[in-house]
C-alpha cells in the first residue's frame, strides 16, 4: 500500500520584487484525514504562511478552485513579493487530531527575490 507523499516539484523559485510567487505542492492521497499547511523555515521558530481555516493571510491565495472537490493540489500564490519573503517554504500534511499532528513535509522550495527591474 502506497504511503501519502507530499510533492514540491521545484527546489527553487526566483521572483522579482513586486511580482507574485507560485509555490507548488501536490499530495498523492486524500488520506490520512487532516489539513495541509504552508510554513517558511523549519523547527519551532518556523513561520506559518497559510492555513485555510485559521488566521488571516491577505497576500496568500490557493491556486486551485476553493470549491473543487477532492482537491490534491495545495499550491499557493504569494502576491507583492519583497526581499523579506526570501526563504525556504514547506508544504506540510497534518493528521487530524486534538491538536493536529504533523505527518509529512514536502522537500521545500527555496524562494529567492530579485531586485525589481528598473
Amino acid at each position: 500500500e502506497e504511503e501519502l507523499q507530499v510533492i514540491q516539484p521545484e527546489k527553487s523559485v526566483s521572483v522579482a520584487a513586486g511580482e507574485s510567487a507560485t509555490l507548488n505542492c501536490t499530495a498523492t492521497s486524500l488520506i490520512p484525514v487532516g489539513p495541509i499547511q504552508w510554513f517558511r523555515g523549519v523547527g519551532p521558530g518556523r513561520e506559518l504562511i497559510y492555513h485555510q481555516k485559521e488566521g488571516h493571510f491577505p497576500r496568500v491565495t490557493p491556486v486551485s478552485d476553493p470549491t473543487k472537490r477532492n482537491n490534491m493540489d495545495f499550491s499557493i500564490r504569494i502576491s507583492n513579493i519583497t526581499p523579506a519573503d526570501a526563504g525556504t517554504y514547506y508544504c506540510v500534511k497534518f493528521r487530524k487530531g486534538s491538536p493536529d499532528v504533523e505527518l509529512k513535509s514536502g522537500a521545500g522550495t527555496e524562494l529567492s527575490v530579485r531586485a525589481k527591474p528598473s
Partner: antibody, heavy 120, light 108 residues
C-alpha cells in the same frame, strides 16, 4: 459508477456483536476516507465513525464498542460492533467521504443501508 | 459539539411553490455545510456542499446560501419528486460530524 453495498445486518441480543461490511466499487477506494452513518427508525441521521488511512474517528456514543477498519486490497469497509445496546438499533449506511478546498469532509455517495436490530 | 437546528420541522407545500429551509449552527462553521435529501426507504443524497455548490446532476432549482451560522436551502419550484426529508450537515469542526434534525416536506 460509484457503488457501495452494505451487508451483515440482522437481529442481535443486547451485549452481542455484529460485523458490517461495505463493498465499494467505481472509484479509487484507497485514497478516500470512508464513514458509517446510522439512522434509528423514524429518526434523523447520526454520524458513527470515519476512517482515513490508519486514522480513525468515533462518535462518543460508540467509542470503545465499535471499531472501523478497511481492507484496500478488497475495496471493503468494515464496522465491528460489540456490546450492542437497544439504542444502537438503526439502519447503518456506508458513505464515501468527499473533501472540498483543503479540508472538510462530507458524504457524496451512500449505500442503501443495512438494518441492525438489537432486541432480546 | 456544533449543534444544527433546522426549521421548520415540517413544511406542507404544493407543487410549483418556492420552498425555503433554514439551518442554524450553534457556532461559526464558515461555509462548511452540506445539504442532503432523503426519500422514504432510500439513502440520503447529496444536494449541496460548501453551502452553495450543487453536486453533479442536481437540478438548478436547488440552491444553497449562507455563511457563518445561518444557512438556507431553496427549491425555486417544488416538483413532485422533491418530497422527502432534507438534512443539513456541518463539517467545519469534527469529530463529531453533526446533522440537523431534518425538515420534512409533505404535499399540501
Amino acid at each position: 459508477e460509484v457503488q457501495l453495498v452494505e451487508s451483515g445486518g440482522g437481529v442481535v441480543q443486547p451485549g452481542g456483536s455484529l460485523r458490517l461490511s461495505c463493498a465499494a466499487s467505481g472509484f479509487s477506494f484507497s485514497i478516500y476516507a470512508m464513514s458509517w452513518v446510522r439512522q434509528a427508525p423514524g429518526k434523523g441521521l447520526e454520524w458513527v465513525s470515519t476512517i482515513g488511512a490508519d486514522d480513525t474517528y468515533y462518535a462518543d456514543s460508540v467509542k470503545g464498542r465499535f471499531t472501523i477498519s478497511r481492507d484496500n486490497s478488497k475495496n471493503t469497509l468494515y464496522l465491528q460492533m460489540n456490546s450492542l445496546r437497544a439504542e444502537d438499533t438503526a439502519v447503518y449506511y456506508c458513505a464515501k467521504d468527499s473533501t472540498v478546498g483543503w479540508s472538510g469532509d462530507f458524504f457524496d455517495y451512500w449505500g442503501q443501508g443495512t438494518l441492525v436490530t438489537v432486541s432480546s | 459539539e456544533i449543534v444544527l437546528t433546522q426549521s421548520p420541522a415540517t413544511l406542507s407545500v404544493s407543487p410549483g411553490e418556492r420552498v425555503t429551509f433554514s439551518c442554524r449552527a450553534s457556532q461559526n462553521v464558515r461555509s462548511d455545510i452540506a445539504w442532503y435529501q432523503q426519500k422514504p426507504g432510500q439513502a440520503p443524497r447529496l444536494l449541496i456542499y460548501a453551502a452553495s455548490s450543487r453536486d453533479t446532476g442536481i437540478p438548478d432549482r436547488f440552491s444553497g446560501s449562507g455563511s457563518g451560522t445561518d444557512f438556507t436551502l431553496t427549491i425555486s419550484s417544488l416538483q413532485s419528486e422533491d418530497f422527502g426529508v432534507y438534512y443539513c450537515q456541518q463539517y467545519y469542526d469534527w469529530p463529531p460530524f453533526t446533522f440537523g434534525g431534518g425538515t420534512k416536506v409533505e404535499i399540501k
